[in-house]
């Protein structure tokens, strides 16, 4: 190997990372010029832009699939971007129906062939953009990795690309003889990578002697509000849950200028920027008479984009609960039901690009995801407190009010690319 390559400044020709197999859609869903109707932001690689749009398509469909299997009172939080990135690691070594299903479920078949063939390179570019922001006021930390049984010999090229693009080689572990020790090792690695924020990503007994390959992806975000909430204005107030019950939440308050719009059927959309302006939190709050489930059902990337495009800066009063959501789950059954069947099947999986001996019995035993978000007066995740001098609660009856005292959707996005980094719902901010 020569000198190490910086993936963030590299050109595609600098890194030969052609996948073992390539996918061609029979319907040719994507064309080279697709997506040109929407203006690509300045200083943005059009292929990274395409990938970001594919991620948004996956984000909304996966969220809907997951939400359908949750109780309406359950909080949900996930990083569709992190999930897509992790599964793109398996795409690099996938062939046949396994590859086709990865392409379809993750919406990679909606992007041009040139982008999808070099998807790892463009994922790396997208991640460079998100994880290497010059602005030090926000922090995005992810830990994505494949862990395989040590009896396998892994393809060296796969290992090199995995390290270069995704920041981690596939790690061999002794699942057969030391399943519980392996679980502890994975959880420790994730904990270290996320500075102790995310622990126990793999639940007990999720790994056994039959485990072959485990995919783990975890992520957390820490950001400071551009305009902080004053703790003196926080009050205990009732939050009305989907089941008609209420609970006592710590409701933060501030008046200020924010991008806001009341859209179809009285749904309110508010954007709260984090310091640096590149990353924002978008809140979607249905009117009291409309259930959040209905909004979730109608949600598409196009609807979301339309709403974001309509936002206008205005003075308003914001009431928003403090909350902490930690959500972790196995992705296996959700993705199998969505059509990603072969990857998890010992009989059908085709991952020849991952192992050295060309074995065709390699499959993913399970995949785990965990993300967490804490929102308070300072921003997301507790930060060192600084004095904030903000006026108290005024009684301006004419001011537009955004009062999140009932279930709402939350997105954290990178603005220029409109990449959905996180999405979820706050159905119960009172849970500790």
């Amino acid at each position: 190997h020569g000198s190490p390559v910086d993936i963030c400044t590299a050109k595609p020709r600098d890194i030969p990372m052609n996948p073992m197999c390539i996918y061609r859609s029979p319907e040719k869903k994507a064309t080279e010029d697709e997506g040109s109707e929407q203006k690509i932001p300045e200083a943005t690689n059009r292929r990274v832009w395409e990938l970001s749009k594919a991620n948004s398509r996956f984000a909304t469909t996966f969220y809907q699939h997951l939400a359908d299997s949750k109780n309406d009172n359950d909080n949900i939080f996930l990083s569709p971007l992190s999930i897509s990135t992790a599964f793109a690691m398996t795409k690099l070594g996938a062939c046949n129906d396994t590859l086709q299903q990865l392409m379809e479920v993750f919406k990679f078949d909606t992007i041009s062939e040139k982008t999808s063939d070099q998807i790892h390179f463009f994922f790396a570019k997208l991640n460079c953009r998100l994880y290497r922001k010059a602005n030090k006021s926000s922090k995005l930390v992810s830990a994505n990795r494949l862990f395989g049984d040590k009896s396998l010999t892994f393809n060296e090229t796969y290992q090199d690309i995995s390290e270069l693009v995704y920041g981690a080689k596939l790690q061999p572990l002794d699942f057969k003889e030391n399943a519980e020790q392996s679980r502890a090792a994975i959880n420790k690695w994730v904990s270290n990578k996320t500075e102790g924020r995310i622990t126990d990503v793999i639940p007990s007994e999720a790994i056994n002697e039959l485990t072959v390959l485990v995919l783990v992806n975890t992520i957390y975000f820490k950001g400071l509000w551009k305009s902080k909430f004053s703790p003196e204005n926080t009050r205990k107030e009732l939050f009305y849950k989907a089941d008609g019950e209420s609970c006592s939440a710590s409701m933060m308050y501030q008046e200020g200028k924010f991008r806001y719009r009341r859209v179809a059927e009285g749904t309110q959309v508010l954007e709260l920027p984090f310091k640096g302006d590149d990353i924002t939190m978008v809140l979607i709050l249905p009117k009291p008479e409309k259930s959040l489930a209905k909004v979730e059902k109608e949600l598409t990337p196009e609807v979301l984009q339309e709403w974001l495009d309509e936002l206008e800066e205005m003075m308003l009063v914001v009431h928003m609960p403090r909350f902490r959501i930690e959500d972790g789950f196995s992705l296996k059954e959700q993705l199998q039901d969505m059509g990603l069947v072969d990857l998890f099947s010992p009989e059908k999986s085709k991952l020849p690009g991952i192992v050295a001996e060309g074995r065709d019995d390699l499959y993913v035993s399970d995949a785990f995801h965990k993300a967490f978000l804490e929102v308070n007066e300072e921003g997301s995740e507790a930060a060192a407190s600084t004095a904030v001098v903000i006026a108290g609660r005024s009684l301006n009856p004419n001011r537009v009010t955004f009062k999140a005292n009932r279930p709402f959707l939350v997105f954290i996005r990178e603005v220029p690319l409109n990449t959905i980094i996180f999405m979820g719902r706050v159905a119960n901010p009172c849970v500790k």
Epitope: D72, A293, K297, D337, M338
Partner: nanobody
Framework: QVQLQESGGGLVQPGGSLRLSCAAS????????WAWYRQAPGKQRELVAS???????NYADSVKGRFTISRDNAKNTVYLQMNSLKPEDTAVHYC????????WGQGTQVTQVT
């Protein structure tokens, strides 16, 4: 891939009853929200009723008090009991997820005979 198989439709007199069944092959069936939809000739597909994993039900105003959605998790089956049928209930009835829809099944035809 999740397969959906609807059955139980047929010809029915005004005021009559039918019970529709839908077998779904989803691994996450028991925790998942399911729904019945219908499509009348020349009209858009519309939501008729839904049921969450916890058993909470919701109905379109036009069928409230007449239709009942239920589920049997042991059989991976969702039902729609249709009573007091009206001419406007004539349509192909489909079942699918509530928020997330899988590939649509063939549906089952419900026809009012007058």
């Amino acid at each position: 891939q999740v397969q959906l198989q609807e059955s139980g439709g047929g010809l029915v007199q005004p005021g009559g009853s039918l019970r529709l069944s839908c077998a779904a092959s989803a691994l996450t069936f028991s925790s998942r929200a399911w729904a019945w939809y219908r499509q009348a000739p020349g009209k858009q597909r519309e939501l008729v009723a839904s049921i969450t994993g916890g058993g909470t039900t919701n109905y379109a105003d036009s069928v409230k008090g007449r239709f009942t959605i239920s589920r049997d998790n042991a059989k991976n089956t969702v039902y729609l009991q249709m009573n007091s049928l009206k001419p406007e209930d004539t349509a192909v009835h489909y079942c699918n997820g509530y928020r997330y829809t899988y590939a649509w099944g063939q549906g089952t035809q419900v026809t009012q005979v007058t």
